[in-house]
């Protein structure tokens, strides 16, 4: 099967909305970068549709995406990482829609990991630490992190703290005593590169101590 549409198919195709969005991930697999695109309308019939990127590439004109279920994906070392590329949705040789995109402005970092919370009894605080693979990267090294925490019973009442380091101190007196808390963290590029928030890290759950009646302080767990 050639993948070329019949004339009727092309006429139908032109009536559809082929708007799409993409994000890049740099050095996501060693020195390899990735680019992921998907249609904004989940109901688009993607059977004969392909994605192609041209321009701002190293020693090639264009690269074709691999189709992975509903998403289109490239993993390569061949991004120049400067200037705009032309990303097109194609049926055979015909481009249905194209976008000029600078891959350095659509960077989505990898999710932080190893989130943990340690209670310090003497200091009456909680030390939140997490890790990010970006500390070892050549390009997207500088990130802004968003730590979000909530009391488990408060469904949508998240408190957010932005920070550039991977360590945060939460004062015990700012938290409810004898309560279960959920905490998570995500990252966004913060220098030279621009883009989107990463996925959230897996949540970490911790309990605050009871209040010690004599001192008015919380009991450690």
């Amino acid at each position: 099967e050639s993948g070329y549409a019949q004339n009727g198919d092309l006429e139908d195709a032109e009536l559809d909305d082929y708007s799409f969005s993409c994000y890049s991930q740099l050095e996501v697999n060693g020195s390899q970068h990735s680019l992921t695109c998907a249609f904004e309308d989940p109901d688009v019939n993607i059977t004969n549709l392909e994605f192609e990127i041209c321009g701002a590439l190293v020693e090639v004109k264009c690269l074709n995406f691999r189709k992975l279920q509903e998403i289109y994906f490239i993993e390569t070392k061949k991004f120049l990482l400067i200037g705009k590329s032309n990303i097109c949705v194609k049926v055979g040789e015909k481009s249905l829609t194209c976008k000029k995109i600078d891959l350095t402005t659509i960077v989505k970092p990898e999710a932080p990991f190893d989130l943990s919370v340690v209670y310090r009894e003497g200091a009456n605080d909680f030390v939140v630490t997490f890790n990010t693979s970006h500390l070892q990267k050549k390009y997207v090294k500088v990130l802004m992190h968003d730590v979000a925490y909530r009391q488990e019973k408060d469904e949508n009442k998240w408190t957010h703290v932005n920070l550039s380091s991977t360590k945060l101190t939460l004062l015990q007196r700012k938290l409810q005593p004898a309560a279960m808390y959920e905490i998570k963290v995500r990252s966004i590029p913060d220098h030279y590169f621009k883009g989107f928030w990463s996925e959230w890290s897996p949540s970490y759950y911790f309990r605050t101590p009871e209040i010690n009646n004599s001192s008015g302080e919380m009991d450690p767990i």
């Epitope: 041209c54 321009g55 701002a56 590439l57 190293v58 020693e59 090639v60 004109k61 264009c62 120049l80 990482l81 400067i82 200037g83 705009k84 032309n86 040789e93 000029k100 600078d102 050549k138 390009y139 030279y192």
Partner: antibody, heavy 119, light 105 residues
Framework: QVQLVQSGAEVKKPGASVKVSCKAS????????MNWVRQAPGQGLEWMGL????????SYNQKFKGRVTLTRDTSISTAYMELSRLRSDDTAVYYC????????????WGQGTTVTVSS | EIVLTQSPATLSLSPGERATLSCSAS?????MHWYQQKPGQAPRPLIY???KLASGIPARFSGSGSGTDFTLTISSLEPEDFAVYYC????????FGGGTKVEIK
Amino acid sequence: QVQLVQSGAEVKKPGASVKVSCKASGYTFTGYTMNWVRQAPGQGLEWMGLINPYNGVTSYNQKFKGRVTLTRDTSISTAYMELSRLRSDDTAVYYCARGDGEYWYFDVWGQGTTVTVSS
Amino acid sequence: EIVLTQSPATLSLSPGERATLSCSASSSVTYMHWYQQKPGQAPRPLIYEISKLASGIPARFSGSGSGTDFTLTISSLEPEDFAVYYCQEWNYPYTFGGGTKVEIK
């Protein structure tokens, strides 16, 4: 104003190497590719390669790969083109040219450096 | 690799006349650029992305075309327009055409 100033003319013997410099001013050096284009006497233009000054990533015309090396020094906003194993048919004017990152045309050019290869 | 063929190689015209320069690609090109070069000078951009005028270029210059056939038009030649004109493909390996020399008749 935006300007690219190249090093002076060179005369080299066959088999030698030449290194041409291109000093940029009036814009953010790391924000645009630097391209190298040559023109043999009475001939047309030939793209040799480019460098991304931000990260040093290069892209070469296959015709020159292995003989041309593009480098840059961001601290002095200068790009370099080194051509090795020179032959008489490398006699040409060598231009550096800034690459526009949106439309990929060469929007600012250096004045050119004449390289003469002669025994 | 795409080959860009410019025609004619030489165009002999008088000031005030209309000049039509062609650039034919061996396979389809998304965008084409045009440059002007005078003797002893570096090229300068005229038209980018088929039809957009580069900075400081007068409106008598225009570009058109798509696919494999592109045209640069100078509506009324001025004395300073007599020069060599090159088309160039927007993508790697940024190939140039062989040039068209516009000379005074």
